[in-house]
Interface confidence: medium
């Protein structure tokens, strides 16, 4: 037998950071340690997310908002809300089941995460290769062969390497 509730649920008065405590006559009680409620009218508080193992705390939990995690150095976040940490690789590599592996010839990766992608095929746009690709960098396409003056080479030596971590804009 459930008592008829008044038109306004008394729990709706409980603000974020509290919960409606049925054991105490529906009084608004503060969330206990290591828990939070981000909206009003909650009947329980949620246990704070814990950033354990390869996760580290980016933002501490408060009574009104959950903790946020990121990854320890050498790892990067994956998934909504950083639900996973994936190992970093070097530029010019990709992560496989067997660890970091160099990009195959004809592919590149200019980041510490993600997969190796094929070099741009300049000829599809009717252009020629201006700068050769490497494991870390895509090719740079130049003008179409028809635009080149007679005797001009369509391939120039690779540009000097940039500092690590600077991706082309």
């Amino acid at each position: 037998f459930e008592r008829t509730r008044s038109l306004q649920d008394p729990c709706s008065n409980c603000p974020a950071g509290t919960f409606c405590d049925n054991n105490r006559n529906q009084i608004c009680s503060p969330c206990p340690p290591n828990s939070f409620s981000s909206a009003g009218g909650q009947r329980t508080c949620d246990i704070c997310r814990q950033c354990k193992g390869v996760f580290r705390t980016r933002k501490e939990c408060s009574s009104t908002s959950n903790a946020e995690c990121d990854c320890t150095p050498g790892f990067h976040c994956l998934g909504a809300g950083c639900s996973m940490c994936e190992q970093d690789c070097k530029q010019g590599q990709e992560l496989t089941k067997k660890g970091c592996k160099d990009c195959c010839f004809g592919t590149f990766n200019d980041q510490k995460r993600g997969i190796c992608r094929p070099w741009t095929n300049c000829s599809l746009d009717g252009k020629s290769v201006l700068v050769n690709g490497t494991k870390e960098r895509d090719v740079v396409c130049g003008p179409s062969p028809a635009d080149l003056s007679p005797g001009a080479s369509s391939v120039t030596p690779p540009a000097p390497a940039r500092e690590p971590g600077h991706s082309p804009q």
Partner: antibody, heavy 118, light 109 residues
Framework: EFQLQQSGPELVKPGASVKISCKAS????????MNWVKQSNGKSLEWIGV????????SYNQKFKGKATFTVDQSSSTAYMQLNSLTSEDSAVYYC???????????WGQGTTLTVSS | ENVLTQSPAIMSASPGEKVTMTCRAR???????LHWYQQKSGASPKLWIY???NLASGVPARFSGSGSGTSYSLTISSVEAEDAATYYC??????????FGAGTKLELK
């Protein structure tokens, strides 16, 4: 001897709700978190969530938010899980499991078989 | 979520044989938070190995666990008939991130 005694099998109709109980004995109920785990058709295990019996605070696997609700009755050392809007996908064996620390489960109930069928 | 892939799905061994099953994580798991459970047909799971290499109470010494990062394994040095069961690995990355592998079923010849 530690024991987690779960309620008996349930046969319910689609759209209905069910409340499964897990009575703890042999240890201080409020000293250990209580987890709930789903096992569908002899397949793998899925963590549904956890309740801290001392405070009543909860944490749910995102997949089960809105589907499962945990409560406890400290006076009878019993944890409850209510499952609502049941469909055939919810047919499974549900276990309660105690965690001495947050990350593993040292004692499990015998399981409650839920069958959702019209 | 951090998916755990167990291999092989099913394995068959003769008594006395050494067997190893693996658990691979999609992303790195702290060795403190990687655990194994044994489940026999029709029974509840039992904690078997916790924190990668610690045997739970009552687990025979022929069982061992090892690993780090994304690769973990459970080894039985000399299989006995009573070891026939399904073994699940489980990882914890802080609430609400707890996942299990799909299990390795060990059958005896």
């Amino acid at each position: 001897e530690f024991q987690l005694q779960q309620s008996g099998p349930e046969l319910v109709k689609p759209g209905a709700s069910v409340k499964i109980s897990c009575k703890a004995s042999g240890y201080s109920f409020t000293d250990y978190n209580m987890n709930w785990v789903k096992q569908s058709n002899g397949k793998s295990l899925e963590w549904i969530g956890v309740i801290n019996p001392n405070y009543g605070t909860t944490s749910y696997n995102q997949k089960f938010k809105g589907k499962a609700t945990f409560t406890v009755d400290q006076s009878s050392s019993t944890a409850y899980m209510q499952l609502n809007s049941l469909t055939s996908e919810d047919s499974a064996v549900y276990y309660c499991a105690r965690s001495p620390v947050e990350d593993y489960f040292d004692y499990w109930g015998q399981g409650t078989t839920l069958t959702v069928s019209s | 979520e951090n998916v755990l892939t167990q291999s092989p799905a099913i394995m068959s061994a003769s008594p006395g044989e050494k067997v190893t099953m693996t658990c691979r994580a999609r992303s790195s798991v702290s060795s403190s938070y990687l655990h194994w459970y044994q489940q026999k047909s029709g029974a509840s799971p039992k904690l078997w190995i916790y924190s990668t290499s610690n045997l739970a109470s009552g687990v025979p010494a022929r069982f061992s666990g090892s690993g780090s990062g994304t690769s973990y394994s459970l080894t039985i040095s000399s299989v006995e008939a009573e070891d026939a069961a399904t073994y699940y690995c489980q990882q914890y990355s802080g609430y609400p991130l707890i996942t299990f592998g799909a299990g390795t079923k060990l059958e005896l010849k």
